[in-house]
Interface confidence: low
């Protein structure tokens, strides 16, 4: 058998790696980098030509509990006048993210991974028009 | 932590947030979406704004293949297909948590880490700074 | 499109034996897994194998009772499955998937075949 190329090494388990029963992952949820910010530019989502506004959604059996999602503020672009122009389009711009989920089964509790979607912003796109023969 | 409510027939044992450490299943919830910005939709070239985007791939991380997006222009595209550079491009930054394996090259133990993305762009209006 | 029809599903007495195979036809991808669901339960990772047939990833459960392989064409990949339980009953499916990490993330696999009822007695 020929030796797994560098791209495997997620195969090959060191002997210091901690017992993990079937099936399962041990998973260590004290964040890296937990008190990274971030460094957008100021009032982003009121400057821009497609403008949003922000939702926080809260979940106690989820972890982070807060997640925020964008929602776009009109369905086309502001334009220089500061009117709507609805040839153009505001659309979403998502990303996903990990969250654990907290499970209750009677008095037994699990956890779970989750891939959530968050919209993080908007953008103004041209529309793609189709034509009907 | 966060504090979780509990059924009020459990013995007392059952901490209230969530521990340090949990053992969690190795499937991953949430089949809807999709991780290839490039296949789920065409607004990085179709928006006024364009950007780029990055394949960053780390096999320590999960998932190992995440796309950082940078802005083509300073400027934003006009009607008129030209760059405009009375308005600006912007990269739209998102928070988002990924698992890192923990110890290295570990199968099936992670710790959780807070990464910054550049998940697309938007076209701002710019703040003008006046100079007395 | 990569289009996958599995085939070699039936009923088998506890400590049996079957021998699963996926028909792959379309463009190349990096990995083939198969993937099992059982009634009520999530859909799990069985065993995968990549592109190049070098490199073969089980899930714990099935290791050492199963074999995955593929032939050197590489449009058609097998589970050898022996010492079967009544636990590893379910509905069998083939999947592709890009990428070789995480193999056991269900969520990565991107084609996936209508399945095959693999059914273990007591």
């Known amino acids: 058998r020929k030796i797994p190329k560098v791209g495997h090494t997620f195969f090959q388990k060191p002997e210091s790696c901690p017992p993990v029963p079937g099936g399962s992952m041990k998973l260590d949820i004290g964040i890296i980098n937990e008190n990274q910010r971030v460094s957008m530019s100021r009032n982003i989502e009121s400057r821009s030509t497609s403008p949003w506004n922000y939702t926080v959604t809260w979940d106690p059996n989820r972890y982070p509990s807060e997640v925020v999602q964008a929602q776009c503020r009109n369905l086309g672009c502001i334009n220089a006048q500061g009117k709507e122009d609805i040839s153009m389009n505001s659309v979403p711009i998502q990303q996903e993210t990990l969250v654990v989920r907290r499970k209750h089964q009677g008095c037994s509790v699990s956890f779970q991974l989750e891939k959530v979607l968050v919209t993080v912003g908007c953008t103004c796109v041209t529309p793609v028009i189709h034509h009907v023969q | 932590g966060i504090t979780i409510p509990r059924n009020p027939g459990c013995p007392n044992s059952e901490d209230k947030n969530f521990p340090r450490t949990v053992m969690v299943n190795l499937n991953i919830h949430n089949r809807n979406t999709n991780t290839n910005p490039k296949r789920s939709s065409d607004y990085y070239n179709r928006s006024t704004s364009p950007w780029n985007l990055h394949r960053n791939e780390d096999p320590e991380r999960y998932p190992s293949v995440i796309w950082e997006a940078k802005c083509r222009h300073l400027g934003c595209i006009n009607a008129d297909g030209n760059v405009d550079y009375h308005m600006n491009s912007v990269p739209i930054q998102q928070e988002i948590l990924v698992l890192r394996r923990e110890p290295p090259h570990c199968p099936n133990s992670f710790r959780l880490e807070k990464i910054l993305v550049s998940v697309g762009c938007t076209c701002v209006t710019p703040i003008v700074h006046h100079v007395a | 499109e990569v289009q996958l029809v599995e085939s070699g599903g039936g009923l088998v007495q506890a400590g049996g034996s079957l021998r699963l195979s996926c028909a792959a036809s379309?463009?190349?991808?990096?990995?083939m897994g198969w993937l099992r669901q059982a009634p009520g339960k999530e859909r799990e990772f069985v065993a995968a194998?990549?592109?190049?047939?070098?490199?073969?990833y089980y899930a714990d459960s099935v290791k050492g009772r199963f074999t995955i392989s593929k032939d050197n064409a590489g449009i058609t990949m097998y589970l050898q499955m022996n010492s079967l339980k009544p636990e590893d009953t379910a509905v069998y499916y083939c999947?592709?998937?890009?990428?070789?990490?995480?193999?056991?993330?269900?969520?990565?696999?991107?084609?996936w075949g209508q399945g095959t009822q693999v059914t273990v007695s007591s």
């Open positions: 999947a592709t998937r890009r990428g070789l990490y995480y193999v056991w993330d269900t969520n990565d696999y991107e084609n």
């Open positions: 194998i990549s592109g190049s047939g070098d490199d073969t």
């Open positions: 379309g463009r190349t991808y990096d990995a």
